[in-house]
Amino acid sequence: EPPTACREKQYLINSQCCSLCQPGQKLVSDCTEFTETECLPCGESEFLDTWNRETHCHQHKYCDPNLGLRVQQKGTSETDTICTCEEGWHCTSEACESCVLHRSCSPGFGVKQIATGVSDTICEPCPVGFFSNVSSAFEKCHPWTSCETKDLVVQQAGTNKTDVVCGPQDRLR
């Protein structure tokens, strides 16, 4: 009775269970009643990352520096190259095929989360009591200066874009 299902790391072909090729190797010829599956190593700059019956290996991804990409993990016969972006840039997609400059947070907004090679800057509006007077990809909202702790008084109120202005207290003569 020919098998209808095969064991793990095997595949069914011509009513027969053949061994799959291991990661890093491609299929040259299926097994027969008398011969084992024939596999061949992937070429340089090619890979296969699973037990497979592929007749062609996949090409390694190229981390093109002209697109702002750099290598995060070199490819091998069993793994693809992993790309990331140069400092100050982040990937435009999960596949990281190109990069864009990190977004800056405008005045009135601060950095909630600094960008990484794979995610953009996350900005948040400065709440009452905090301000940001610069456009930056790193600066958080800063707290208003506390005039009281300096023995001064508020002469000009702060906003989400400006700090308070402190001045001397009016002394009664």
Epitope: P23, G24, P41, C42, G43, E44, S45, E46, D49, Q59, H60, Y62, C63, R70, V71, Q72, Q73, K74, G75, T76, S77, E78, T79, D80
Partner: antibody, heavy 119, light 113 residues
């Protein structure tokens, strides 16, 4: 027997150019990635550039980017390094080395060729 | 870039003695896909080009005597020569083979006492 033979070294003036060659024999050249690695006199090893077996992938060290160009001619079993805008700090023995598709390591090195940049 | 730091810079050991040298990388060299550490050791004898000794941290290249062994994972690696022979006098370089730019340690020079 695997053989890698570099040539093209010599004395060059700062700002000048030089083209190094690496002649490969004893293996199927088109199946292997290739690297250039250099070694300044009395110093350690510094990777310079890589080119994949099929010419598709090329990477450079930041120190040479925009000045050096790696290339290969699989029909001639040859690897090249075009060096422009040479500086005194480029003075070194330049080695070519091959990379296979299994270990992904530099498994054979040539004897090297010395490039001296001086006025 | 990954910085490779080797220690000691040099050491003098008697013939037949055990030699141990260290290599540390500034970030992990573990390939997440195949769980191999891409740390390579090269040997450079005086006046000669480098020669591949060990790849994937601990796999000896064909023809390399079994007195040479590599170990470690992540960021800390070691090369050991179990019994030093006269022909082992050389500089030993560890190398990041995990990512570009490929980077080398400064080397450990092994001499005979």
């Amino acid at each position: 027997e695997v053989q890698l033979v570099e040539s093209g070294g010599g004395l060059v003036k700062p700002g000048g150019s030089r083209r190094l060659s690496c002649a490969a024999s004893g293996f199927t050249f088109s199946d292997y990635g290739m690297h250039w690695v250099r070694q300044a006199p009395g110093k350690g090893l510094e990777w310079v550039a890589y080119i994949s077996s099929g010419n598709r992938i090329i990477y450079y060290a930041d120190t040479v980017k925009g000045r050096f160009t790696i290339s290969r001619d699989n029909a001639k079993n040859s690897l090249y390094l075009q060096m422009n805008s040479l500086r005194a700090e480029d003075t070194a023995v330049y080695y070519c080395a091959r990379q296979d598709g299994y270990r992904y390591a530099m498994d054979y090195w040539g004897q090297g060729t010395l490039v001296t940049v001086s006025s | 870039d990954i910085v490779m730091t080797q220690s000691p810079d040099s050491l003098a050991v008697s013939l037949g003695e055990r030699v141990t040298m260290s290599c540390k990388s500034s970030q992990s060299l573990l390939n997440s896909g195949n769980q191999k550490n891409y740390l390579t050791w090269h040997q450079q004898k005086p006046g000669q080009p480098p020669k591949l000794l060990i790849y994937w941290t601990s796999t000896r290249e064909s023809g390399v005597p079994d007195r040479f062994s590599g170990s470690g994972s992540g960021t800390d690696f070691t090369l050991t020569i179990s019994s030093l022979q006269a022909e082992d006098v050389a500089v030993y370089y560890c190398q990041n083979d995990y990512t570009y730019p490929l980077t080398f340690g400064g080397g450990t020079k092994v001499e005979i006492k």
